[in-house]
Amino acid sequence: IWELKKDVYVVELDWYPDAPGEMVVLTCDTPEEDGITWTLDQSSEVLGSGKTLTIQVKEFGDAGQYTCHKGGEVLSHSLLLLHKKEDGIWSTDILKDQKEPKNKTFLRCEAKNYSGRFTCWWLTTISTDLTFSVKSSRGSSDPQGVTCGAATLSAERVRGDNKEYEYSVECQEDSACPAAEESLPIEVMVDAVHKLKYENYTSSFFIRDIIKPDPPKNLQLKPLKNSRQVEVSWEYPDTWSTPHSYFSLTFCVQVQGKSKREKKDRVFTDKTSATVICRKNASISVRAQDRYYSSSWSEWASVPCS
């Protein structure tokens, strides 16, 4: 058993049918010694008397808020949550496996640049009685500070009969050095509590591996005289790291016909312009990627040819 926060305790339960459970001793936080009784949640049933209460925690029915009283007055509370392990594996029931980029991916994180700021998000089908707490650091043995905000509900999606809820959190490395080579990964830890169930999820990454630039901005077309060709130009996104001479991007320019089946013409360039043939009803799209490290491509920025 360990303390999650004041008066909230997590009981680690190795569960299997007929498991004996965990013996837990609760102590009433009071100088009083006599006439103390214990109850669970809203029930008036007295579970025991005395300054300590010993309970056998076998299942969620044994978890909840234990209260000690004296003469009708509440003395203290202890909320017991369960962290369940089955077959040696901690439960991961609260969050949905996003299966990208691999199975058992519960947390996904992205950074728009090398400033040390990043966003993580996760999915659940649970709509109520749900709280998250996020901590982060660079490295784990001698951790350097990363400050995370509160997790917030960022999107709701309907998937068939079910609703899916996306939560996200923004974090910032306290002393980020954008140009430095990373040797220790960022660690992100999410505590999830649903009703009386506690679970924790972790992710470990280098900022360089989660970089995904914003799409190029100010995408423009300039027709070339007496030609079907156009000059496409764009700019680095505002959110990308500076100076651009050091934090350079490479770009992919694509001409896509109205039909998805039509052949796509693609050009790769390190410049912020390209010359392409603009077909009728086609659109031109440009996306960006770190020039020197193959992390994710940005989403496309697009303009119609007409």
Epitope: W15, P17, E59, F60, G61, T125, N162, K163, K195, L196
Partner: nanobody, 123 residues
Framework: EVQLVESGGGVVQAGESLRLSCAAS????????MGWFRQAPGTEREFVAA????????YYADSVKGRFTISRDNAKNTVYLQMSSLKPEDTAVYYC????????????????WGQGTQVTVSS
């Protein structure tokens, strides 16, 4: 919302068997842990059995252990309670319930309930 409809109840002789079914509709069935409870007249609702959302783990009340088997078919959105060696004291209304906490024998840990199906065991 999850809607639960129990079926399969009836009148049987002591020692006989009965299979209860609970069909779920609404939200995704496989997200939920499922349980069976029962209530005899003048008594509180009593836990019978529960099964995890994957179907890999089960949990039983001592009074039915070895006689009752809970199972589920996520493809059919259905949970079953196979009851054998029935006794007169098994007579009750049997309720199906869906929740997110497994294992739990406490009724308020379940979020959705069916209307119940009557099982009567005569001696």
């Amino acid at each position: 919302e999850v809607q639960l409809v129990e079926s399969g109840g009836g009148v049987v002789q002591a020692g006989e068997s009965l299979r209860l079914s609970c069909a779920a509709s609404g939200r995704i069935f496989s997200d939920y842990e499922m349980g069976w409870f029962r209530q005899a007249p003048g008594t509180e609702r009593e836990f019978v059995a529960a099964i995890s959302w994957r179907g890999s783990s089960t949990y039983y009340a001592d009074s039915v252990k070895g006689r009752f088997t809970i199972s589920r078919d996520n493809a059919k959105n259905t949970v079953y309670l196979q009851m054998s060696s029935l006794k007169p004291e098994d007579t009750a209304v049997y309720y199906c319930a869906a929740g997110r906490l497994f294992p739990s024998s406490r009724s308020r840990d379940y979020d959705y309930w069916g209307q119940g199906t009557q099982v009567t065991v005569s001696s």
